[in-house]
């Protein structure tokens, strides 16, 4: 696993402990919380990042209408169970034996149950809609400039292959970024859209996961883009299974 050799840190994940104990004295980094080795040349999986976060000390209408099956992460933080590859286990349980099924981005997709709850497979989130509202600017952003800047950001900062940024919509002051990645499209080594979206979310919140970086401050043709609000919608390959009681709430 590559890491900055000179001072042995992980450029893509500050929530790690690194030491030169890899093969040939190479720098090796392990995620806090899980102790799993991470590849510092790419993004760390959201599951390992959430686990590390929980272990850390506490300190004309062009816009897309989210589908009726779109999930929003309303449950907040929890200490997840990750598989040996760092992915979310399909079933998550808390210390009081309350269990639920999650999708590949760790968002609950069923009602909560007990230990008898079965989650047969980890359902893939194949479509993510990032909905941003920006603060007033000197003028509306040029759509093509905004599109280019956001695509550049996901390509360069998050190392997400450009083909997975399906669209950038803009209707002042709302910006929507659509990420799409089916199981069949994702090749070995490709960054997962869920991981890229999580890094982006943390950047926007001023909690960058990259080593030695502050929050993400975007500029489009020099114009500061100050984000007022962020909502992220997750669409799974198989619709979620919630009881009617929740759907009508």
């Amino acid at each position: 696993h590559t890491a900055a050799q000179d001072n042995c840190t992980c450029p893509t994940n500050k929530m790690t402990v690194c030491s030169p104990d890899g093969p040939g004295g190479r720098c090796q980094c392990r995620a806090l919380g899980s102790g799993m080795a991470v590849d510092c040349s790419t993004l760390t999986s959201k599951c390992l990042l959430l686990k590390a976060r929980m272990s850390a000390p506490k300190n004309a209408r062009t816009l897309v209408r989210p589908s009726e099956h779109a999930l929003v992460d309303n449950d907040g933080l929890y200490d997840p169970d990750c598989d040996p590859e760092g992915r979310f286990k399909a079933r998550q349980c808390n210390q009081t034996s309350v269990c639920w099924c999650v999708n590949s981005v760790g968002v609950r997709r069923t009602d909560k149950g007990d230990l008898s709850l079965r989650c047969d497979e980890l359902v893939r989130t194949h479509h993510i809609l990032i909905d941003l509202r920006h603060r007033p600017t000197a003028g509306a952003f040029n759509h093509s400039d905004l599109d280019a800047e956001l695509r550049r950001l996901f390509r360069e900062r998050y190392r997400l292959h450009p083909k997975f940024v399906a669209a950038v919509h803009y209707e002042q002051p709302t910006i929507q970024i659509e990420l799409r990645q089916n199981t069949s499209q994702k090749a070995a080594g490709d960054v997962d859209i869920g991981d890229a979206a999580y890094y982006f979310e943390r950047d926007i919140k001023g909690e960058s996961l990259f080593q030695g970086r502050g929050g993400l401050d975007l500029r489009v043709r020099g114009e500061p883009l100050q984000v007022e609000r962020t909502l992220i919608y997750y669409l799974d390959e198989i619709p979620p299974k919630f009881s009617m009681k929740r759907l009508t709430a």
Epitope: R135, G139, K205, G206, G215, R221, G222, E223, Q226, E228
Partner: antibody, heavy 119, light 106 residues
Framework: QVQLVQSGAEVKKPGASVKVSCKAS????????IHWVKQKPGQGLEWIGY????????KYNEKFKGRVTITRDTSASTAYMELSSLRSEDTAVYYC????????????WGQGTLVTVSS | DIQMTQSPSSLSASVGDRVTITCKAS??????LAWYQQKPGKAPKLLLY???SLETGVPSRFSGSGSGTDYTLTISSLQPEDFATYYC????????FGQGTKVEIK
């Protein structure tokens, strides 16, 4: 290296106008906005507004709207801040500033221009 | 507008002292906080941005911490050249500065 050089001190009478310039060098002028910041003698800093040299767009602090006009001349890599209907409380040092390359904080500052309003 | 309240407004300290200045925002600014140092007759100088990131060339005795609405600038061991006025600034929603903290020689 990045430099912002401002015009010299001005003494003006109440009711007059003043135009302060800020010449940028060492970077592509249209890449970053130019902010203007006011500092009254012995007091704190107050953001006035900015201009985006790329498209001439401006954004102002509500407090200064109406009396302040920020303009630019891209061929001269210069931004201007004009303040009209001057009064004694406009006596201050006015700074231009450029953002940091990866944040919206202000990294490079001009040396400041003292504007004195006195009858 | 977001208000930034800095405290104390002034403090007296000696060379070698540990100095702490706090800044409170009227709402969550999501770590979009910068700290500046200003000496008499000079323009402000950026010390830290993103609440914790040290600007290039700034000595490591300066550090920042905090989140949400509460932020702190710490000078671990005050040096003679550190006697100055310090300002916090938020850049989450336009730009506003704290009223400043003057660090004087005891």
């Amino acid at each position: 290296q990045v430099q912002l050089v401002q015009s010299g001190a001005e003494v003006k009478k109440p009711g007059a106008s003043v135009k302060v310039s800020c010449k940028a060098s060492g970077y592509t002028f249209t890449t970053y906005v130019i902010h203007w910041v006011k500092q009254k003698p012995g007091q704190g800093l107050e953001w006035i507004g900015y201009i985006n040299p790329n498209n001439d767009g401006t954004k102002y602090n509500e407090k200064f709207k109406g009396r302040v006009t920020i303009t630019r001349d891209t061929s001269a890599s210069t931004a201007y801040m004009e303040l009209s209907s001057l009064r004694s409380e406009d006596t201050a040092v006015y700074y231009c500033a450029r953002p940091h390359f990866e944040t919206h904080a202000m990294d490079y500052w001009g040396q400041g221009t003292l504007v004195t309003v006195s009858s | 507008d977001i208000q930034m309240t800095q405290s104390p407004s002034s403090l007296s300290a000696s060379v070698g002292d540990r100095v702490t200045i706090t800044c409170k925002a009227s709402e969550d600014i999501f770590n979009r906080l910068a700290w500046y140092q200003q000496k008499p007759g000079k323009a402000p100088k950026l010390l830290l941005y993103g609440a914790t990131s040290l600007e290039t060339g700034v000595p490591s005795r300066f550090s920042g911490s905090g989140s949400g609405t509460d932020y702190t600038l710490t000078i671990s061991s005050l040096q003679p050249e550190d006697f100055a006025t310090y300002y916090c600034q938020q850049y989450w929603n336009t730009w506003t500065f704290g009223q400043g903290t003057k660090v004087e020689i005891k």
